[in-house]
């Protein structure tokens, strides 16, 4: 009779993570008598996956009934496959021996490849805000995928970016892989509503890539532009001085009026108006009673935006250009939240 052969008909088996892998194995003879064992890998470090004779292998089930005397099918199923299960599996026939069974013949091996989806890409931006014209870095990370081949693209508002660096780790063989990419983005004043998108394509995603996004509103700081103007109002001895704070982001802003260098009033931007590009405008005004002044007044609008050093704009109020009321050296404060008489 011809010597027993161990047949593993499948050279490769491809399984998605979470599924069950079937590893096929048949023997060509019932002789010699002895059990079958399954191993992952070869050499002294091979791992026992299933032993027909003894042991507890909760993830493994046999395809046929191995207790039947004439059984020659030693195929197994391994449940709930993970990337850690990847490797070459060998079906090995042992010959009954005393005191121990002796390895008799091995199958050629079946390489199990596990396809595992990448995790949702996580995009993170810089820790601190940056202003337009500055270059900022965004990172994108995705983990746990297999096989190693993966494609990563960066977009800003739908336009593909080219300035980025990507690494897939580890470099050598591994059960699963991670991708890490860093993209450089130049900020513009119009970027409050912009989005940076990291897109990951992998064989497990069937052409439907995963995306991670970051809103530039969390990264950008658009500093305000200031304009101080005056126009006469109400009585001829009163002047309305306005400070227009334009095109700033984020909203966090504090404004201080100074009269000849002395703090007159401080207020926080509340009722702002939003521009189409996502930036804000705000206006503060003062009612100045010029009759209370003998000399010219230097009015300064000082703005501290988002914790940054203050910026200011000054306006010289020519007192001589206005008639003075005798004895008028005090003025009542207006109740308007953005108005105040200076005296």
């Amino acid at each position: 009779e011809e010597e027993l052969q161990v047949i593993q008909p499948d050279k490769f088996v491809l399984v998605a993570a979470g599924e069950t892998a079937t590893l096929r194995c048949t023997a060509t003879s019932l002789i010699p008598v002895g059990p079958i064992q399954w191993f992952r890998g070869a050499g002294p470090g091979r791992e026992l996956i299933y032993n027909q004779k003894e042991g507890h292998f909760p993830r493994v089930t046999t395809v046929s009934d191995l207790t039947k005397r004439n059984n020659m099918d030693f195929s197994i199923r391994i449940g709930n496959i993970t990337p850690a299960d990847a490797g070459t599996y060998y079906c090995v026939k042992f010959r009954k021996g005393s005191p121990d069974d002796v390895e008799f013949k091995s199958g050629a091996g079946t390489e199990l490849s596990v396809r595992a989806k990448p995790s949702a890409p996580v995009v993170s931006g810089p820790a601190a805000r940056a202003t337009p014209q500055h270059t900022v870095s965004f990172t994108c990370e995705s983990h746990g995928f297999s096989p190693r081949d993966i494609t990563l693209k960066w977009f800003k508002n739908g336009n593909e970016l080219s300035d980025f660096q990507t690494n897939v780790d580890p470099v050598g063989e591994s059960v699963s892989y991670s991708i890490h990419s860093t993209a450089k983005v130049v900020l513009t004043r119009e970027d409050v509503h912009s989005q940076v998108i990291c897109e990951v394509a992998h064989v497990t995603l069937q052409g439907d890539p995963l995306r991670g996004t970051a809103n530039l509103s969390e990264t950008i700081r658009v500093p305000p532009t200031l304009e101080v103007t005056q126009q006469p109002v109400r009585a001829e001895n009163q002047v309305n001085v306005t400070c227009q704070v334009r095109k700033f982001y984020p909203q966090r802003l504090q404004l201080t009026w100074l009269e000849n260098g002395n703090v007159s009033r401080t207020e926080t931007a509340s009722t702002v108006t939003e521009n189409k590009d996502g930036t804000y405008n705000w206006m503060s005004w003062l009612l100045v009673n010029v009759s209370a002044h003998r000399d010219d007044v230097k009015l300064t609008c000082q703005v501290e935006h988002d914790g940054q050093p203050a910026v200011s704009k000054s306006h010289d109020l020519k007192v001589s250009a206005h008639p003075k009321e005798q004895g008028s050296n005090t003025a009542a404060e207006n109740t308007g939240s953005n108005e105040r008489n200076i005296y």
């Epitope: 064992q37 191993f39 070869a42 050499g43 002294p44 470090g45 091979r46 791992e47 026992l48 021996g97 005191p99 121990d100 002796v102 390895e103």
Partner: antibody, heavy 122, light 107 residues
């Protein structure tokens, strides 16, 4: 009780070969991989390779391929290692040890031979 | 190849003292690490297998542990026979590799 008895000290000339033995007793020889480890004078341990007596399957550390050759005689439960083209670098104590036929934690390198000292000198 | 970096290479300690030796693995080896003891006459004995399992006949003052890629052998309460050489060994991946060794000397 499991024991490994290694052959005695060898003095050899450069360019020649030496063959040392490791006889196992106390368990089934064919259920284990036999490993060889080198320790140079005042140095650490280096794994050379291993052999599986059932089918003479061998695995080597790349550094020792072509330098060491592993064989077994199952009938006498003896493992052999031949070290060829000897140089001063080969002067060392060589140990045999074993691991189970698959990667069973408890069986890795439990038992060790007493070592064979090889001195290479002109 | 997986590098096993063992520290310190030598250590002076006193009887009764507690000491720890460390091996750092350059790649993931899981728990597949042994600690070996070598006597001055060359005799090698395994103390710990699978990172923390104590071999039979080994005194309980020896223990093994792991933190990430760092593996430690701790001897609590040194005795005179403990002042010998110690090696770690990874058996996760071929070629199997050893740490450089630690020589434990009496103070």
């Amino acid at each position: 009780e499991v024991q490994f008895q290694q052959s005695g000290t060898v003095l050899a000339r450069p360019g020649t070969s030496v063959k040392m033995s490791c006889k196992a007793s106390g368990s089934t020889f064919t259920s284990y991989w036999m490993h060889w480890v080198k320790q140079g004078p005042g140095q650490g341990l280096q794994w050379i390779g291993a052999i599986y007596p059932v089918n003479n399957d061998t695995t080597y550390n790349q550094k020792f391929k072509g330098k060491a050759e592993l064989t077994v005689v199952t009938s006498t439960s003896t493992a052999y290692m031949e070290v060829s083209s000897l140089t001063n670098e080969d002067s060392a104590v060589y140990y045999c040890t074993r691991s189970f036929y698959y990667s069973l934690d408890a069986a890795w390198f439990v038992y060790w031979g007493q070592g064979t000292l090889v001195t290479v000198s002109a | 190849d997986i590098q096993m970096t063992q520290s310190p290479s030598s250590l002076s300690a006193s009887l009764g003292e507690r000491v720890s030796l460390t091996c750092r693995a350059s790649q993931d080896i899981g728990s597949r690490l042994n600690w070996l003891q070598q006597e001055p006459d060359g005799t090698i004995k395994r103390l710990i297998y699978a990172t923390s399992s104590l071999d039979s006949g080994v005194p309980k003052r020896f223990s093994g542990s792991r933190s990430g890629s760092d593996y430690s052998l701790t001897i609590s309460g040194l005795e005179s026979e403990d002042f010998v050489d110690y090696y770690c060994l990874q058996y996760a991946s071929s070629p199997f590799t050893f740490g450089g060794g630690t020589k434990l000397e009496i103070n």
